[in-house]
């Protein structure tokens, strides 16, 4: 997977008045990394791993960048000539990626009241607008505002692309993201299903990086894909991931089944607990 930096900013207007303040979150490699603390008006790291990325350096640069981006987005919202009654939101998501072959991608997406209305490839400066008439109108409003100074705009997009990549490289240089490995906690549970059957669930949690193999085996052989049910691999809010896999088996055959887990070159197998013991938890 590529390394990525994702900025997510939201500003609000109420009855046509753009509200002060903004919401901002930054994700690094898909993990919550920074958020803007509205009380303290500062960028704050999300968890210990995020603090480790910059070590003892301050977050002044991130605070300044997010504050500037929030101000720009508020000005953009002020130029949207749309429904003025009630509460409305303008969200900007900006993503840059560095792939294994060192190629890069950058994009920017605008959402109004949660609906995507404008996307841009920051490298080619190519715009994409959904077909709906509302999206077309909103996109025209925003593009006209952004294009008021054409040369400034061109420089602006190039800078956004370059700045995002520069920040991403800066974070990666710390080595924290690249070398971090947190082994999963594996937890097997059973629950009653239909008569004569039980559902066994294998959960892996608190692991990093994201890539993991989690599958049920019968007599040492992996079950077919269609006999298992998988959960998505999702961030758990602590800079690590979680996922699960479940299958249905005949009661009495529990000892034939094991959950197989492979992560960062290590692997382990985990048995189904007997009926008396509900949960078996192990950290390999």
């Amino acid at each position: 997977e590529p390394h990525s930096l994702r900025y997510n900013l939201t500003v609000l207007s109420w009855d046509g008045s753009v509200q002060s303040g903004f919401l901002a979150e930054v994700h690094l490699d898909g993990q919550p990394f920074l958020r803007y603390d509205r009380q303290k008006c500062r960028a704050k790291p999300q968890g210990q791993w995020a603090e480790d990325v910059l070590g003892n350096k301050t977050w002044d640069r991130e605070t300044r960048d997010l504050t500037g981006n929030g101000k720009d987005l508020r000005m953009t919202l002020a130029h949207i000539k749309d429904q003025k009654e009630g509460l409305h939101s303008l969200q900007e998501i900006r993503v840059c990626e560095i792939h294994e072959d060192n190629s890069t991608r950058s994009s920017q997406h605008f959402y109004y009241d949660g609906e995507l209305f404008l996307s841009q490839n920051l490298e080619t400066e190519e715009w994409t607008v959904p077909q709906s008439s509302r999206a077309q109108t909103l996109a025209m409003n925003v593009r006209n505002f952004l294009k008021e100074d054409a040369m400034k705009t061109k420089t602006h997009y190039h800078a956004m692309h370059a700045d995002c990549l520069q920040e991403l490289r800066r974070y990666l240089e710390s080595g924290v993201v690249l070398r971090r490995t947190v082994p999963p906690m594996v937890n097997v549970t059973r629950s009653e299903a239909s008569e004569g059957n039980i559902t066994v669930t294998c959960r892996a949690s608190s692991f990093y990086p994201r890539n993991i193999i989690l599958t049920w085996r019968q007599d040492g052989v992996s079950l077919s894909h269609d006999t298992q049910q998988w959960g998505d691999v999702l961030p758990d809010g602590n800079g690590t991931y979680q996922t699960w896999v479940a299958t249905r088996i005949c009661r009495g055959e529990e000892q034939r089944f094991t959950c197989y887990m492979e992560h960062s070159g290590n692997h382990s197998t985990h048995p189904v607990p007997s009926g008396k013991v509900l949960v078996l938890q192990s950290h390999w």
Partner: nanobody
Framework: QVQLVETGGGLVQPGGSLRLSCAAS????????IGWFRQAPGKEREGVSC???????YYADSVKGRFTISRDNAKNTVYLQMNSLKPEDTAVYYC??????????????LGQGTQVTVSS
């Protein structure tokens, strides 16, 4: 009968203060976003401020830094503290529920309102 009753208006000199109250009867305000809007003679209804059930507040540009909205769920009342009043704040002030919706002013039931007059 479900209704919102506005009180606290009056005549005040420029630079003065007033505190408006919006009391609910027949239902509890706890779960509602409650807002104030105003209407001056010959003008459209204009949103003033809004407070959500969890205490988030929103203000019109024209009143930011001068007006403060608050709520007291125990008293089933929402307040609008108006400081540094200006002649252009003169209007009838109404409160209404669901001030986050995109038709909250348009569809609002007009109660008696409370008249605020700022004049020397």
């Amino acid at each position: 009968q479900v209704q919102l009753v506005e009180t606290g208006g009056g005549l005040v000199q420029p630079g003065g203060s007033l505190r408006l109250s919006c009391a609910a009867s027949g239902f509890t305000l706890d779960y509602y976003a409650i807002g104030w809007f105003r209407q001056a003679p010959g003008k459209e209804r204009e949103g003033v401020s809004c407070i959500t059930s969890d205490g988030n507040t929103y203000y019109a540009d024209s009143v930011k830094g001068r007006f403060t909205i608050s709520r007291d769920n125990a008293k089933n009342t929402v307040y609008l503290q108006m400081n540094s009043l200006k002649p252009e704040d003169t209007a009838v002030y109404y409160c209404a529920a669901d001030c986050l919706s995109s038709t909250w002013r348009t569809n609002a039931y007009l109660g008696q309102g409370t008249q605020v007059t700022v004049s020397s």
